[in-house]
Every structure is written in structure tokens, then in C-alpha cells.
Amino acid sequence: YCSGSKLKGPELSLKGTQHVMQAGQTLFLKCRGEAAHSWSLPTTVSQEDKKLSVTRSACGRNNRQFCSTLTLNMAQANHTGLYSCRYLPKSTSKEKKMESAIYIFVSDAGSPFIEMHSDIPKLVHMTEGRELIIPCRVTSPNITVTLKKFPFDALTPDGQRIAWDSRRGFIIANATYKEIGLLTCEATVNGHLYQTSYLTHRQTNTILDVQISPPSPVRFLRGQTLVLNCTVTTDLNTRVQMSWNYPGKATKRASIRQRIDQSNPHSNVFHSVLKINNVESRDKGLYTCRVKSGSSFRTFNTSVHVYEKGFISVKHRKQQVQETIAGKRSHRLSMKVKAFPSPEVVWLKDGVPATEKSARYSVHGYSLIIKDVTAEDAGDYTILLGIKQSKLFRNLTATLIVNVKPQIYEKSVSSLPSPPLYPLGSRQVLTCTVYGIPQPTIKWLWHPCHYNHSKERNDFCFGSEESFILDSSSNIGNRIEGITQRMMVIEGTNKTVSTLVVADSRTPGSYSCKAFNKIGTVERDIRFYVTDVPNGFHVSLEKIPTEGEDLKLSCVVSKFLYRDITWILLRTVNNRTMHHSISKQKMATTQDYSITLNLVIKNVSLEDSGTYACRARNIYTGEEILRKTEVLVRDLEAPLLLQNLSDHEVSISGSTTLDCQARGVPAPQITWFKNNHKIQQEPGIILGPGNSTLFIERVTEEDEGVYRCRATNQKGVVESSAYLTVQGTSDKSNLE
């Protein structure tokens, strides 16, 4: 030290702005000044540290100056920092320099960083656009430090935006989102890598949501405890200040508790709970939760009502009688209720608790929800409201009518794949059993056939657009005997049975019964196809043919039920039935009700025997139907007389019969001869069936002679003859 003229300010023994020393050495630092002074040390150096000592003495010319010596034994790396000597306040004039400082680096190759955050990074708060310091200060000014952002970004000092200061760390002039993350300062000393980590944490003012529960309006009875919870959701880096405005704020009526919930890793939830015990009428009004975060400001209001005593008022929301429709997904029976506190709610259906009656009933608030409405849901519904503590009870009844769209029972029972056929001329009873609420009106209609005269088909009955409403005296289509309607209880419900009686089935078409009420309309179509063919399909054989004769088969089908009519021959080969088509079939002929297809096979032989089938396709089902007939062509057989003629006598004026029964295939033709002359039928001579008998009445003597019968067919001829003797000839007559 020089003891020259007056000092400009405190003077340190170590000159310059910084000084480097090795760890383990002792730091000696003297301060001389014109006034009393004190030492300011790095935060890492404790004033109570046994290694630290400060000795004060008078010094300088005439001991008029103040000196103090700071001694730090066995200096450590973390003792690195700013050491300053400062005049005590009011101890010197304002013109003087008040403080002198020096930055001491305590260099330690094993501790390049003053603070090591290797296990858990140190949190550093940052604000975008402001200066950010990553405080990885070093123990020696010549240590090279790099700054990395995890995982692999390097933040390189450019002397402007990012600068390195061995005393302060990395200084980022105006921080951006790019600096948010895990930042690591790295230094390699003597081949060893040292790292200290910092987690930059951006402070934001993002208020995501503000809510008050319970939701507004909030109702209380006098004397109850009012509790309101204001919940604020912010992003992870936001902190908020919460306050309440409320009617009793001036008298501090409420106690307010605050807490923070950080269980969500990506947001913060702040709670402010306002509580007033024994709420009074003066506490009613607007309660406002005010939330502030930096420049962000949000408020949320709720309205509080305080009632002296409980109350219930109940009215019909709609009319007392409500209507709904069966099949509806749900129906809500709802009453207009004003009540406090919330009453107990019970709904009755016809005097029985509704929810016990059916699982389809559920109570929501003051409403009864009926799911999947059915006719059984009709009835009287009563809402019972009760507040037991206030001994308050109210009830109100509403009537529910369940309307049902008309249903025709016969439509629901499985219908036949193809319509029935009605025999020509028959009396028919057509019935529709109808249910609906309100009771449906039933009408019968007649739809005449509309023929589609296309090449493909000219005999099918299409439903026509035109229709005629029928009554008991209608003669359109078919003569109507009558239309009747009667009520019947079927399966526990009132149903209307409507009957249409057709007196004489002649005209094909379709009848329909139409049932309608205010809910809707339903129609059942009854195709009325008249047939002149038993069962709508008939096969006949004219006669059993004999070899050489013609085979004649006939197939008649209902034209309303069948199409594609054809004859086929069935043959069995190796236990398999083969269908053989028959060529040279005639064209089918169409009549009023049927289609006829005749099959004629001329000059049949035994080989033509077999199973003949008429095949037709059902118009409705597409199914092929076969009707079979066995044809056995008979073999030719030569005639055979079953009994020969025998001579016999007959009295004159008597009568006689000659019998010539013959068998053969084909049936033989019988011819009679008398004395070789062919007998023709004439008065007195009668030929019986098939000429097999010869009857002579009032025999005369001319009738005597040789009678011969001849049986003939393609296979041969057979004859028999006999002599007829007439007794009492001219002798008798002469006697007369």
C-alpha cells in the first residue's frame, strides 16, 4: 500500500477486476479506506465459516485510515465469486466512491463449475423477450464451456444474442421458445467431462378455464352453509391470483381457502373455496371469482338465492291429458316444478310406483321417461313431491293416452308364399281383424284385374291402380252378400272383426281391407283368384290307349298361379329319374281362369308307356310343380268269345236274347249275321251295348235260321253260330 493523498474510495490489495488462485491456497485480501467499511462475499462463503477471518485495524498516516484484512484458509472452488469492500452508510461524503470489488476465481481442475446440477437440473425461470442467464459460472476464466439443449441442439455464443461470461454463465439477450428445455453446460478439464444442467421454465399467463361450482343459480335455506368452489385451469407454467367479490365482502362474511392441484403433468388447477356458515338473507346476490395472471384477467359469476323456508309449486307443463304413440322410442311426462330445497320425487302409474311397474320407466329430475312406448303405458300418472324436513308435500296427476296405429292381425300371421284360389261359383268369407287406438275405421275395396297384354304374357292379373269402395249391396267385381263388423276381445284387447262375404266367386282381382285412424293407415291385400280347376292344377287321361291308337292327355292350371306349362316324360335310368321333353306339343290355350295344354301322341306303341308329367312354374315362388299320370299302352289281343252261341227254341210271338260276349284288345267290334246276311237294327230287332246282345221281340217264323256273331279287332276275328227254331209255325196259324 502507498500512504499517499486521500483515497478516492476503498482500496483493495489485489489490483484489477479479477484474480485467479488455486483451490487449497489461502486468500488474503486487504481493504483500506477513509471510513469504516464492511465486506460483501459470494453467497457460497458463509460469514460463520471457521476458515474465514476478518481483522480490522487503524492504518495510514496518523492511523487516520480504516483497514481490514479478509483471510480465507483452504479456499474451495465454490468460494469463487465477487468480493467487495464497501463503506458503511453515512460514513463518508457522497462524492466518494463507495465500493471496490474483485472477482476471485478459485481454480480446481476437479470442479470446473461452481454449482453442479448433475442429478437434478436446476429450474431457471424465463420470460420470452427478456434476458435469460444460464448460471453455469466457472472456477477459472480460461475454462471453455459449451451450451447444449437436449437432445442435440448446440447453443453457440455469437457475442450478441448469446454471450459467455465466466463470472455469470451464458447470457441470452432476448430469450425465445428455442431456449425452453433442458440446457446443459459442458466443460472438459484434463480429459474429464463435467456437466451441469438447467431446466428453463417459461412463465406464461394462460388461463384456460374458470368455473364456479355448484353452477349458477345456487340456492340455500337460511342457516345452511354456503360453499362455492372457483376452479381455474392454467397451463403448466402459469400462476394466478384469485379473489372474490360478494355481498358480504365489506364485513368479511366469508372464509376463503386456496389450494393448487398439480397432479396433471400438463396443466395446473387452482381452487379458491368461499365458505359462509349460517347463511342469511343478506348473503344473497352476485358472487364473482376474479382471476389474474400477469396481464390476463378473467371473472366468473354465480347468483346466490337465500330462502327463508322451503316451498313446492307444481303445474302441468302441457295439458292435463297427454297423448303419445305406441312404438315411440321414448315419451317424457314432465311437470313444471318450482321447489327448494330439492324435493323427493316419486311417480305413480295408476296408483303404483311407476319404476316398480316396469324397467322401461325412469325418473329424471321432475320427469318420468317411458322408453319404447306400448299401449299398456296408457293411464293416470301422478307426481308426488315431498320435502320431509319442511313437511311439504304436493301431487299432481296427468292422464296419458297411448294411440296405436291400426294393425291387421291377419297381416302379421305368416302368409302363404302364393295366394289361395277360390273355386268358381263358391261363397267366400274374407276377414280382417283390426286393432288400433282410437278405434280404426275399416273400408273394403275392390281392385279389378289389369291385364298386361304383352307378348311374353297376356293372362296374368296385375293389381290395377283403380279401386272401388265396397258396401253390402255392391256388385262390382263379385256379388257381395254382405259386409259386417263386430267387436271381439281377443288376447285381452278389443279388436274389430270385419267380414266381407262374396256370394258368388266369378271375377278375379283383389280385395283389400283398409283400417285407418288419426295415427295412420294399414291395408291388407287379399288376392282373389278364381279357379275352375280343382286345386288350380289338374291332369287327365282321355282313355287308356291301345297300341296303334292316339294317346290324349290334358293339363289344366290356374292362370293366376302358374306359368311355363309343359308336358314331360319321366324315365328311370340307373335309379335316377330323367326328365325328357316331349316334342311337337300343342300351344297352350288360355281361358277365363285357366291355361290348358293338351298332349296328343298318335299311333302309340308299347314303348310310349310311362310316367307323363305336366310341369308348371309357380308365379309367386318360382317353384316348379309336377303333376304325374301313369300311362300303360295296352298290347293287342285277338278277340276271344267268352261263351259260344247255342241252338235254342223259341215260341212264336215270344222274345229271345242272343249273347255274344267277347274279349280282346282293342275291344272287339261285334257284327251279327242271319243266314249269312248282316243284321241291322230294325223294329223288333234290338242290338244291345256294343252290339254284344241281339234281342228279338215278337218272334215270327221268318226269324228262324242260323244266327252268327263275329268279334273283330286288328289282331283277328272269331265267330260263333247257333240255330234258332221257332215253334208253332203255320200249322198253328192255319188252325186259327
Epitope: 437432445p151 403433468p265 400438463h266
Partner: antibody, heavy 119, light 111 residues
């Protein structure tokens, strides 16, 4: 709610290509690095690729280097991995993960999308 | 072959303490933070431990992590049946310039 949703997986023939997408919601996507990690059936987790917050630096696992490319579009809050020259051994569930929040580990994961490479 | 080494399986009865080890090298565990992940059957992994020993909010304090040199370990005390899962350790690897994982340890809760 913080969410990652992967898409683009499917069946592809060896030598074919696929592009997987990972859409982020509920956090500041542009601030954090994104990763793709895969898991073959019955096997452990295998890191595939990482991209920094700005999309300027990428790193790929040796097994996929030269065939796979990680990228991101911060305007769409979406990360991608383009997979070319696919092999049978690339068949796996591919997860997208991000290093959000304060942990800087993979603290948000998607549900995964399945990639099957088979002829 | 995983860069980090974990035992393939571990087991314990309810209430017991179980430790899972994870061993690496200077380029990964020694110079970087260790993370532990839990993967329940059929789900995506979930972060269990970060910065060697820190628990994210929502993770029970039965789970704890530690690191020493090139090794790390996960301890689960008061084992519960819902802890049955696969556990993976993970860290950044400076030489690979990427994440590395252990092969996973299947934890079975007996009884």
C-alpha cells in the same frame, strides 16, 4: 388433454414404402423434440429416430439410417417418418413420443400404429 | 442386443420390495439422465421415473430410481398386483446420438 395419435400403418411388401404420421394436441408442439420408437411382437422397445423442436436436426438408429427419414411440420402439429426399402424385420408397432413437460424423457406416447412387412 | 442391460425377469409377492438393475457405459448412463418406463400388457409405455430419481405426478412413491456411475436401478416397494408389467430403462447415448433402451424386465407378482 395431451395426446399423440399415430396413423399410416398397414401391410406392405418387402421393398415397399410407408409414411407414418403423428398428430399432437394439447401442448406446445413446436417447443419439444419428437421421437419414433418401435416394438416388434414379443420384443422390447427400440429407438428409431429423433428430431429437434425446430426440425433442423435429426438422428436415426443405425438399423434404419438411409432408409427412414424423420420430419415434422410445426404448423400442422405433426411429426412424420418416411420408411423406404422396408424389410420383414421392420414389422412392429411404431410409437410416436415427445419430450414435453418438465421431464425431458419420453413422457407422452401415442397408442401406436402397426406396420407389417410381408410378401 | 440392447445397449443397456436389464435382467429379463423379476418377481415378488405382494408387499415385497423388488429392484431392477440397468447397466450401461460412460457414453450413456454415466453422462446422461436415466428414465424408467412401465408398459402394461397391450398398452403404450408410460414414463415412471425421470432425471434418474424423479417421479412424474400421479406415480406412487412406492417407485424410486437411483443412478451411480454407469448403472441405474428401479426399486418398487410394497409390491402390488397392478405392478405386473414390463419395465424398461432408457437414456440418451452421446456416441450413438440417440436414445437407448434396456431389453426390458418382465415383473411378475406371485400369489
Amino acid at each position: 388433454e395431451v395426446q399423440l395419435l399415430e396413423s399410416g400403418g398397414g401391410l406392405v411388401q418387402p421393398g415397399g414404402s410407408l409414411r407414418l404420421s403423428c398428430e399432437a394436441s394439447g401442448f406446445d408442439f413446436s417447443t419439444y423434440a419428437m421421437n419414433w420408437v418401435r416394438q416388434a411382437p414379443g420384443k422390447g422397445l427400440e429407438w428409431v429416430a429423433t428430431i429437434n423442436s425446430e426440425g433442423t436436426i435429426t438422428s436415426h438408429a443405425p438399423a434404419v439410417k438411409g432408409r427412414f427419414t424423420i420430419s415434422r411440420d410445426n404448423s400442422k402439429n405433426t411429426a412424420y417418418v418416411q420408411m423406404n426399402s422396408l424389410r420383414a424385420e421392420d414389422s412392429a408397432v411404431y410409437y410416436c413420443s415427445s419430450t414435453t413437460g418438465t421431464t425431458h424423457g419420453m413422457d407422452v406416447w401415442g397408442r401406436g400404429t402397426t406396420v407389417t412387412v410381408s410378401s | 442386443q440392447s445397449v443397456l442391460t436389464q435382467p429379463p425377469s423379476a418377481s415378488g409377492t405382494p408387499g415385497q420390495r423388488v429392484t431392477i438393475s440397468c447397466s450401461g457405459s460412460s457414453s450413456n448412463i454415466q453422462n446422461n439422465y436415466v428414465y424408467w418406463y412401465q408398459q402394461l400388457p397391450g398398452t403404450a409405455p408410460k414414463l415412471l421415473i425421470y432425471f434418474n430419481s424423479q417421479r412424474p405426478s400421479g406415480v406412487p412413491d412406492r417407485f424410486s430410481g437411483s443412478k451411480s456411475g454407469t448403472s441405474a436401478s428401479l426399486a418398487i416397494s410394497g409390491l402390488q398386483s397392478e405392478d405386473e408389467a414390463d419395465y424398461y430403462c432408457g437414456t440418451w447415448d452421446d456416441s450413438l446420438n440417440g436414445w437407448v433402451f434396456g431389453g426390458g424386465t418382465k415383473l411378475t407378482v406371485l400369489g
